[in-house]
């Protein structure tokens, strides 16, 4: 189809080489009831269509995305770029930053219902640049945490070095929906609830003498509980002696509960004490068996191929640790009578 009639939008993605961030393009087709943009040839050049995320269909995945090769080849279906670029509803997600994402992306409805609809399309010219060292050193992260039950804020990474006073008007989206009341470079949350979690997008317009473009950043916001003030506790083994049969295989499980920590480096290991000696045992990997907002239960097993007389003289110690401290639980084997 002929893309010369498409509305054009320029976007800039400045990515940090230090972080793994993603980017999105919305299919900014207008709402039919608010604009005649899809019947573009009826508009006079002075009439500017209103740009809003596409709401013209009940099924928001009813748009088709294309990529325009720089060499002038025919348009390519965006699905060819899977899994680096993924479409979800009317949004295109770029999973890996890089200048190779620069280019033109076109979206239009899948169902063309009238000859006028052929021109109902948007061409997005995306420029992707790595962040220069000269840029603000302490820019906000693309992953931000909000503490449940407290006040918090979400900052637009591309504007976080500017004061509120000098910041341009910002357009915010959450999970693809326009947040019409938010216009500043920071969203202030009076009390954080679970529903504040999501993918936020902030846009602002930058202009020079020649043209203007939209600078966009994506922020992943997690709602979390506060870091634990407790060291982990061992849930199993509870008893410090265990009845066993000599010559039989044995598995002893150590289950420990770790409170939430933003920087989570849990340690769970087994070691053996034999008179004055002690050594760590090579055991299967630890596994998370339950995870909630507040804590995580991790299990690690020690496996004896067969219980020997020597094992009865040893102590098997489970050691667990987080940033607060450590806990141990030892088990002495006792022959079953």
């Amino acid at each position: 189809f002929n893309i010369s009639g498409c509305s054009t939008k320029k976007l800039l993605w400045t990515y940090s080489t230090r972080s793994e961030e993603e980017f999105v393009l919305f299919c900014d087709l207008p709402e039919p009831q608010k604009s005649h943009f899809c019947h573009r040839n009826r508009l006079s050049p002075k009439q500017v269509p209103e740009h809003l995320p596409f709401m013209g269909s009940n099924d928001l995945s009813d748009v088709q995305w294309y990529q325009q090769p720089s060499n002038g080849d025919p348009l390519e279906d965006i699905r060819k770029s899977y899994p680096h670029i993924i479409q979800d509803k009317c949004t295109l997600h770029f999973l890996t930053p890089g200048v190779n994402n620069s280019g033109s992306y076109i979206c239009r409805p899948k169902m063309i219902k009238s000859p006028y609809d052929v021109a109902c399309c948007v061409k997005m010219i995306l420029e992707v640049k790595p962040q220069t060292n000269a840029s603000c050193e302490y820019s906000a992260s693309h992953k931000q945490d909000l503490l449940l039950g407290s006040t918090g804020s979400i900052s637009c990474p591309s504007l976080s070095c500017q004061s509120d006073a000098q910041s341009p008007a910002v357009t915010w989206y959450k999970n693809g929906k326009l947040l019409s009341v938010e216009r500043s470079n920071r969203i202030v949350v009076d009390e954080v609830y679970d529903y504040h979690q999501g993918t936020y997008v902030c846009d602002y317009t930058q202009s020079d003498t020649v043209s203007s473009w939209t600078v966009r950043a994506v922020v992943q916001v997690r709602t979390i509980v506060g870091d634990t003030k407790l060291k982990p506790d061992i849930l199993d083994p509870v008893e410090d002696t265990l009845e066993v049969e000599l010559g039989k295989p044995l598995t002893i499980s150590c289950k420990a509960r770790f409170g939430f920590e933003r920087v989570f480096n849990p340690v769970i290991k087994w070691y053996i004490k034999d008179s004055d000696l002690e050594w760590e045992v090579s055991v299967p990997e630890a596994k998370s068996i339950k995870s909630t907002l507040k804590d995580e239960i991790i299990e690690r097993n020690i496996i004896l191929e067969k219980v020997t007389q020597r094992d009865l003289r040893r102590k098997f110690v489970c050691f667990v640790q987080n940033s607060i401290g450590n806990t141990t639980q030892s088990v002495q084997l006792k022959e079953k009578r």
Partner: nanobody
Framework: QLQLLESGGGLVQAGGSLRLSCAAS?????????MGWYRQAPGKGRELVSS???????NYVDSVKGRFTISRDNSKKTLYLQMNSLRAEDTAVYYC??????????LGQGTLVTVSS
Amino acid sequence: QLQLLESGGGLVQAGGSLRLSCAASRSITFSHNVMGWYRQAPGKGRELVSSIGSGGSTNYVDSVKGRFTISRDNSKKTLYLQMNSLRAEDTAVYYCGVVVGVYRGSLGQGTLVTVSS
């Protein structure tokens, strides 16, 4: 924290079928994310096999198109992968994970699928 737990793997003859399931621990995280199935064959890197958006749009790598079907049930916080006409080269550990969203990169612990020829 988000926990993902896969099930449904096993040993199957070439040409057979399996259905993998993945249960998530948080509904608010699950429903707003693009979820997917990754696999890692012995001695190879992990690849994204298929993904499904919050609106239900699906994607597949060429090698599984027409044979695998991804689906999700947001009310049950569960992701599925129906695998038909299985081939020996489908043998791998299959992981369910968040492809796009807040917990992007979160993976389950994997379920082994072995296809014997």
